[in-house]
Protein backbone atom coordinates (compact mmCIF):
# COMPACT_ATOMS: atom_id res chain seq x y z
CA UNK A 1 0.00 0.00 0.00
CA UNK A 2 0.97 3.62 -0.58
CA UNK A 3 2.67 5.27 2.45
CA UNK A 4 0.31 7.81 4.07
CA UNK A 5 0.81 11.56 3.47
CA UNK A 6 -1.50 12.58 6.30
CA UNK A 7 -2.53 10.97 9.57
CA UNK A 8 -5.62 10.94 11.74
CA UNK A 9 -6.15 13.19 14.73
CA UNK A 10 -3.82 12.36 17.65
CA UNK A 11 -1.32 10.81 15.22
CA UNK A 12 1.80 12.12 13.52
CA UNK A 13 3.66 11.13 10.39
CA UNK A 14 7.21 9.83 10.69
CA UNK A 15 9.27 7.59 8.45
CA UNK A 16 6.25 7.26 6.14
CA UNK A 17 4.01 5.89 8.85
CA UNK A 18 1.44 7.19 11.30
CA UNK A 19 2.35 7.00 14.97
CA UNK A 20 0.13 7.80 17.96
CA UNK A 21 0.88 11.04 19.76
CA UNK A 22 1.57 10.86 23.48
CA UNK A 23 -1.36 11.89 25.66
CA UNK A 24 -1.25 15.03 27.85
CA UNK A 25 0.96 14.43 30.87
CA UNK A 26 3.34 12.15 28.94
CA UNK A 27 6.41 12.72 26.77
CA UNK A 28 7.77 10.80 23.78
CA UNK A 29 10.46 8.21 24.44
CA UNK A 30 10.52 6.53 21.04
CA UNK A 31 8.55 6.70 17.82
CA UNK A 32 6.48 3.75 16.71
CA UNK A 33 7.77 1.34 14.13
CA UNK A 34 6.12 -1.16 11.82
CA UNK A 35 6.12 -3.56 14.77
CA UNK A 36 5.87 -1.37 17.92
CA UNK A 37 3.60 1.32 19.35
CA UNK A 38 4.79 4.82 20.23
CA UNK A 39 6.52 4.69 23.61
CA UNK A 40 5.59 7.46 26.08
CA UNK A 41 6.58 8.19 29.67
CA UNK A 42 4.76 10.25 32.32
CA UNK A 43 6.19 13.71 33.05
CA UNK A 44 8.18 13.95 36.27
CA UNK A 45 7.31 15.87 39.41
CA UNK A 46 7.09 19.64 38.68
CA UNK A 47 6.71 18.97 34.94
CA UNK A 48 3.75 19.00 32.55
CA UNK A 49 2.57 18.68 28.97
CA UNK A 50 -0.92 19.97 28.26
CA UNK A 51 -1.55 18.66 24.72
CA UNK A 52 -1.35 15.46 22.70
CA UNK A 53 2.28 15.68 21.69
CA UNK A 54 5.55 14.25 20.41
CA UNK A 55 7.73 16.28 22.76
CA UNK A 56 10.82 14.55 24.13
CA UNK A 57 10.93 16.87 27.18
CA UNK A 58 8.16 17.98 29.49
CA UNK A 59 7.82 21.69 30.40
CA UNK A 60 8.76 22.87 33.87
CA UNK A 61 5.91 24.15 36.03
CA UNK A 62 5.91 27.91 36.42
CA UNK A 63 7.63 29.11 39.61
CA UNK A 64 5.61 31.60 41.65
CA UNK A 65 8.47 33.73 42.99
CA UNK A 66 7.59 35.14 46.43
CA UNK A 67 10.24 37.84 45.91
CA UNK A 68 8.01 39.20 43.15
CA UNK A 69 4.91 38.97 45.34
CA UNK A 70 3.67 35.78 43.69
CA UNK A 71 2.03 32.78 45.31
CA UNK A 72 0.47 29.58 43.98
CA UNK A 73 -3.20 29.96 43.09
CA UNK A 74 -3.48 26.47 41.58
CA UNK A 75 -0.84 23.77 41.82
CA UNK A 76 0.26 22.31 38.50
CA UNK A 77 -0.36 18.70 37.51
CA UNK A 78 1.28 16.50 34.87
CA UNK A 79 -1.24 18.01 32.42
CA UNK A 80 -1.50 21.61 33.59
CA UNK A 81 0.89 24.41 34.46
CA UNK A 82 0.94 26.06 37.87
CA UNK A 83 -1.19 29.21 38.06
CA UNK A 84 0.31 32.10 40.02
CA UNK A 85 -1.49 35.01 41.65
CA UNK A 86 -0.33 37.98 43.71
CA UNK A 87 -0.23 38.39 47.46
CA UNK A 88 -3.39 39.95 48.89
CA UNK A 89 -3.64 43.64 48.02
CA UNK A 90 -1.30 43.36 45.03
CA UNK A 91 -2.25 42.99 41.37
CA UNK A 92 -0.89 40.98 38.43
CA UNK A 93 0.89 42.99 35.74
CA UNK A 94 -0.43 40.72 32.97
CA UNK A 95 -2.75 37.81 32.21
CA UNK A 96 0.18 35.44 32.78
CA UNK A 97 0.79 37.03 36.22
CA UNK A 98 4.58 37.06 36.06
CA UNK A 99 4.99 39.89 38.57
CA UNK A 100 2.94 42.05 40.92
CA UNK A 101 2.29 45.74 41.40
CA UNK A 102 0.53 47.60 44.18
CA UNK A 103 -1.70 49.09 41.50
CA UNK A 104 -1.37 50.23 37.91
CA UNK A 105 -1.11 53.84 36.85
CA UNK A 106 -3.23 55.58 34.25
CA UNK A 107 -1.10 56.82 31.34
CA UNK A 108 -1.10 60.41 30.06
CA UNK A 109 -4.39 61.02 28.27
CA UNK A 110 -6.22 58.96 30.89
CA UNK A 111 -7.48 59.84 34.35
CA UNK A 112 -8.26 57.73 37.39
CA UNK A 113 -11.95 56.81 37.54
CA UNK A 114 -11.52 54.64 40.65
CA UNK A 115 -8.53 54.31 42.94
CA UNK A 116 -7.33 50.74 43.49
CA UNK A 117 -8.41 48.72 46.50
CA UNK A 118 -7.18 45.45 47.93
CA UNK A 119 -9.38 43.55 45.51
CA UNK A 120 -9.67 45.75 42.41
CA UNK A 121 -6.95 47.49 40.43
CA UNK A 122 -7.00 51.14 39.34
CA UNK A 123 -9.77 51.91 36.84
CA UNK A 124 -8.74 54.41 34.19
CA UNK A 125 -10.87 56.43 31.79
CA UNK A 126 -9.89 58.44 28.71
CA UNK A 127 -9.89 62.19 29.24
CA UNK A 128 -12.90 63.62 27.37
CA UNK A 129 -12.76 66.77 25.24
CA UNK A 130 -12.08 69.72 27.53
CA UNK A 131 -9.95 67.67 29.92
CA UNK A 132 -6.35 66.43 30.00
CA UNK A 133 -3.82 64.42 31.96
CA UNK A 134 -0.11 64.90 31.28
CA UNK A 135 1.13 62.46 33.92
CA UNK A 136 1.13 58.77 34.71
CA UNK A 137 -0.85 58.48 37.94
CA UNK A 138 -2.72 56.08 40.19
CA UNK A 139 -4.89 58.80 41.78
CA UNK A 140 -5.15 61.90 39.58
CA UNK A 141 -8.31 62.54 37.61
CA UNK A 142 -8.37 64.30 34.25
CA UNK A 143 -7.98 68.07 34.75
CA UNK A 144 -10.18 70.60 32.93
CA UNK A 145 -8.44 72.76 30.36
CA UNK A 146 -7.58 76.23 31.60
CA UNK A 147 -10.29 78.75 30.75
CA UNK A 148 -8.40 81.53 28.96
CA UNK A 149 -11.52 83.71 28.81
CA UNK A 150 -11.81 83.99 32.60
CA UNK A 151 -8.23 85.33 32.65
CA UNK A 152 -8.98 87.82 29.88
CA UNK A 153 -6.72 85.86 27.57
CA UNK A 154 -7.23 83.96 24.32
CA UNK A 155 -6.35 80.41 23.32
CA UNK A 156 -2.99 80.41 21.56
CA UNK A 157 -2.67 76.64 21.37
CA UNK A 158 -5.53 74.17 21.58
CA UNK A 159 -5.54 71.60 24.36
CA UNK A 160 -5.48 67.85 23.82
CA UNK A 161 -6.23 64.87 26.06
CA UNK A 162 -2.57 65.07 27.19
CA UNK A 163 -1.92 68.82 27.25
CA UNK A 164 -3.58 71.93 28.63
CA UNK A 165 -4.49 74.84 26.37
CA UNK A 166 -1.91 77.60 26.07
CA UNK A 167 -3.34 81.05 26.76
CA UNK A 168 -1.93 84.29 25.40
CA UNK A 169 -2.69 88.02 25.39
CA UNK A 170 -5.57 89.29 23.31
CA UNK A 171 -4.63 90.96 20.04
CA UNK A 172 -4.98 94.68 20.81
CA UNK A 173 -4.71 95.69 17.13
CA UNK A 174 -8.33 96.21 16.23
CA UNK A 175 -9.58 98.42 13.37
Amino acid sequence: PEPPTACREKQYLINSQCCSLCQPGQKLVSDCTEFTETECLPCGESEFLDTWNRETHCHQHKYCDPNLGLRVQQKGTSETDTICTCEEGWHCTSEACESCVLHRSCSPGFGVKQIATGVSDTICEPCPVGFFSNVSSAFEKCHPWTSCETKDLVVQQAGTNKTDVVCGPQDRLRA
Partner: nanobody
Framework: EVQLLESGGGLVQPGGSLRLSCAAS????????MWWVRQAPGKGLERVSA????????YYADSVKGRFTISRDDSKNTLYLQMNSLRAEDTAVYYC?????????RGQGTLVTVSS
Amino acid sequence: EVQLLESGGGLVQPGGSLRLSCAASGYTFAGYEMWWVRQAPGKGLERVSAISGSGGSTYYADSVKGRFTISRDDSKNTLYLQMNSLRAEDTAVYYCAKEPYSFDHRGQGTLVTVSS
Protein backbone atom coordinates in the same frame (compact mmCIF):
# COMPACT_ATOMS: atom_id res chain seq x y z
CA GLU B 1 18.94 49.46 42.35
CA VAL B 2 15.79 51.14 43.68
CA GLN B 3 15.69 51.25 47.49
CA LEU B 4 13.05 52.71 49.79
CA LEU B 5 13.75 52.92 53.50
CA GLU B 6 10.93 53.86 55.88
CA SER B 7 11.55 55.18 59.38
CA GLY B 8 9.86 57.16 62.15
CA GLY B 9 7.46 54.53 63.49
CA GLY B 10 7.05 53.72 67.14
CA LEU B 11 4.67 53.47 70.06
CA VAL B 12 2.42 56.48 70.58
CA GLN B 13 -0.65 57.19 72.73
CA PRO B 14 -4.06 57.85 71.14
CA GLY B 15 -4.26 61.50 70.09
CA GLY B 16 -0.48 61.67 69.63
CA SER B 17 1.59 62.45 66.54
CA LEU B 18 4.35 60.82 64.50
CA ARG B 19 6.24 61.80 61.36
CA LEU B 20 7.22 59.00 59.02
CA SER B 21 10.03 59.36 56.48
CA CYS B 22 10.84 57.37 53.37
CA ALA B 23 14.38 57.80 52.01
CA ALA B 24 14.67 56.87 48.34
CA SER B 25 17.82 55.91 46.49
CA GLY B 26 18.84 54.26 43.23
CA TYR B 27 16.64 56.41 41.00
CA THR B 28 15.73 60.02 40.28
CA PHE B 29 13.21 60.74 43.03
CA ALA B 30 11.85 64.00 41.59
CA GLY B 31 8.94 63.59 39.22
CA TYR B 32 7.74 60.22 40.49
CA GLU B 33 4.36 59.83 42.13
CA MET B 34 4.69 58.31 45.62
CA TRP B 35 2.28 56.52 47.96
CA TRP B 36 2.00 55.58 51.60
CA VAL B 37 0.17 52.30 52.22
CA ARG B 38 -0.32 50.38 55.44
CA GLN B 39 -1.07 46.87 56.62
CA ALA B 40 -2.72 46.31 59.99
CA PRO B 41 -2.10 42.97 61.74
CA GLY B 42 -4.09 40.26 59.97
CA LYS B 43 -5.56 42.75 57.48
CA GLY B 44 -5.03 43.57 53.81
CA LEU B 45 -3.13 46.53 52.38
CA GLU B 46 -4.80 49.93 52.68
CA ARG B 47 -3.85 52.84 50.45
CA VAL B 48 -3.38 55.78 52.81
CA SER B 49 -2.06 58.76 50.87
CA ALA B 50 -0.34 59.77 47.63
CA ILE B 51 1.49 62.77 46.23
CA SER B 52 2.09 63.64 42.59
CA GLY B 53 5.55 63.88 41.05
CA SER B 54 5.35 67.67 41.14
CA GLY B 55 3.99 67.72 44.69
CA GLY B 56 1.02 69.77 43.50
CA SER B 57 -1.65 67.07 43.92
CA THR B 58 -2.36 64.85 46.90
CA TYR B 59 -4.76 62.07 47.81
CA TYR B 60 -5.95 60.91 51.24
CA ALA B 61 -8.09 57.91 52.17
CA ASP B 62 -11.28 58.93 53.96
CA SER B 63 -10.03 57.23 57.12
CA VAL B 64 -7.08 59.68 57.47
CA LYS B 65 -8.42 62.88 55.87
CA GLY B 66 -7.79 65.93 58.05
CA ARG B 67 -5.36 64.05 60.29
CA PHE B 68 -2.51 62.99 57.96
CA THR B 69 -0.41 65.18 55.66
CA ILE B 70 1.83 63.87 52.89
CA SER B 71 4.78 65.89 51.59
CA ARG B 72 8.03 65.44 49.73
CA ASP B 73 11.47 67.04 49.66
CA ASP B 74 13.04 66.32 46.29
CA SER B 75 16.35 67.87 47.37
CA LYS B 76 16.59 65.18 50.06
CA ASN B 77 14.98 62.37 48.02
CA THR B 78 12.57 61.90 50.91
CA LEU B 79 8.83 61.37 51.29
CA TYR B 80 7.05 62.25 54.56
CA LEU B 81 3.80 61.42 56.31
CA GLN B 82 2.82 63.65 59.22
CA MET B 83 0.28 61.77 61.32
CA ASN B 84 -1.74 63.69 63.93
CA SER B 85 -4.65 62.71 66.20
CA LEU B 86 -3.60 59.08 65.97
CA ARG B 87 -6.15 56.37 66.78
CA ALA B 88 -5.84 52.70 67.74
CA GLU B 89 -7.06 51.78 64.22
CA ASP B 90 -3.99 53.50 62.71
CA THR B 91 -1.82 50.71 64.17
CA ALA B 92 -0.10 49.07 61.19
CA VAL B 93 3.14 48.63 59.29
CA TYR B 94 3.50 51.65 56.98
CA TYR B 95 5.20 51.32 53.60
CA CYS B 96 6.10 53.84 50.94
CA ALA B 97 5.84 52.89 47.27
CA LYS B 98 6.98 54.46 44.01
CA GLU B 99 5.52 54.25 40.53
CA PRO B 100 5.32 51.70 38.90
CA TYR B 101 4.76 50.14 42.33
CA SER B 102 6.38 46.77 41.70
CA PHE B 103 6.44 44.35 44.64
CA ASP B 104 10.22 44.03 44.58
CA HIS B 105 10.62 47.82 44.96
CA ARG B 106 8.73 48.06 48.23
CA GLY B 107 10.49 48.98 51.46
CA GLN B 108 10.58 46.93 54.67
CA GLY B 109 8.08 49.23 56.35
CA THR B 110 7.96 50.94 59.73
CA LEU B 111 5.66 49.81 62.54
CA VAL B 112 3.28 52.33 64.10
CA THR B 113 1.56 51.22 67.32
CA VAL B 114 -1.14 53.43 68.83
CA SER B 115 -1.94 52.29 72.35
CA SER B 116 -2.39 53.66 75.83
